[in-house]
């Protein structure tokens, strides 16, 4: 990265992350930079690469929906890190002004 | 309140076609994914088919791959269900269903679908 | 696609605990729902994400889900309890899939 930026999701991953694995996602929003929107994905593990998905498709909805009700243990990391789960070629977004992170609200049960 | 109901069911001949309603009132109608659930006299629940907020992506279960197809219109408040090649098999009450996460917590009362000749 | 087996009926006297099992290969990594459903009514909910119970449902039902099952338990199970039971769980495809049902029975 240069001067620190970091790179923008410029592909969705293929492979799905199952629910019980995930901590927690952030928006990516091509409104702040990047050229693509995209939902990112992180994992229990930190040591796991995030994974970029469609905020189109149906079980990235799901899983979204799910962590928004869901009451969070812990907040997701600071910033927007590169997503080495996905292929990225092309144009970066600079800095983290490409991501915007959602993290769980505390709402009572049911919607 | 919250309400989703079933329309369109009936009566229809083996390898006709049918296409149930389900019209929704007091929430957000594309905020939610929605999906079809049926029943068979008798029988258990089966999940049918799932369509995603806006209508991009869909899910069907093998039994009505090809033959059934879900659809929405969120400027309506209404999900669809297209079915078609419609076999004595397919006969049962079918319900439409609002998803929540993993979870489907709003159900319609159910629209009867009897395939028969 | 998961298959989900659940008992096809089970039995107990008003205030006995009951429990119902789901059982799945690996249904432990998914979420995993269970549906009430009496006579002539649609289905209602009363718990997902395995083991959380939406407003509304008694606090004598709860959830588990670990490994290849996943129980529902009634604990001092009422009359009005008496309902077919179906145990839910979406997979990564996503496509969903219901338990067969189980019919449980107060004595």
């Known amino acids: 990265s240069d001067g620190g930026a970091q790179d923008c999701c410029l592909k969705y991953s293929q492979r799905k992350i199952p629910a019980k694995v995930v901590r927690s996602y952030r928006k990516q929003e091509p409104s702040l930079g990047c050229s693509i929107p995209a939902i990112l994905f992180l994992p229990r593990k930190r040591s796991q690469a995030e994974l970029c998905a469609d905020p189109k498709e149906l079980w990235v909805q799901q899983l979204m929906q799910h962590l928004d009700k869901t009451p969070s243990p812990q907040k997701p990391a600071q910033g927007c890190r590169k997503d080495r789960g996905a292929s990225k070629t092309g144009k970066k977004g600079k800095g983290s002004k490409g991501c915007k992170r959602t993290e769980r609200s505390q709402t009572p049960k049911g919607p | 309140q919250v309400q989703l109901v079933e329309s369109g069911g009936g009566l229809v001949q083996p390898g006709g076609s049918l296409r149930l309603s389900c019209a929704a009132s007091g929430f957000t109608f594309n905020s939610y994914s929605m999906s079809w659930v049926r029943q068979a006299p008798g029988k258990g629940l089966e999940w049918v088919s799932a369509?995603?907020?806006?209508?991009?992506?869909?899910s069907y279960a093998d039994s009505v791959k090809g033959r059934f197809t879900i659809s929405r219109d969120n400027s309506k408040n209404t999900l669809y269900l297209q079915m078609n090649s419609l076999r004595a098999e397919d006969t049962a009450v079918y319900y439409c269903?609002?998803?929540?996460?993993?979870?489907?917590?709003?159900w319609g009362q159910g629209t009867l679908v009897t395939v028969s000749s | 696609d998961i298959e989900l087996t659940q008992p096809p009926s089970v039995s107990g006297s008003p205030g006995q605990s009951i429990t119902i099992s789901c059982s799945g290969d690996s249904i432990g990594s998914q979420y995993a729902s269970w549906y009430q459903q009496k006579p002539g009514q649609a289905p209602v909910v009363v718990i997902y994400d395995d083991n959380e119970r939406p407003s509304g449902i008694p606090e004598r039902f709860s959830g588990s889900n670990s490994g290849n099952t996943a129980t529902l338990t009634i604990s001092g199970t009422q009359a009005e309890d008496e309902a077919d039971y179906y145990c839910g769980s979406w997979d990564s495809n996503p496509t969903h899939v219901f338990g067969g049902g189980t019919k449980l029975t107060v004595l």
């Open positions: 269903a609002r998803g929540y996460g993993y979870y489907f917590d709003v």
């Open positions: 369509i995603s907020m806006e209508g991009y992506s869909k």
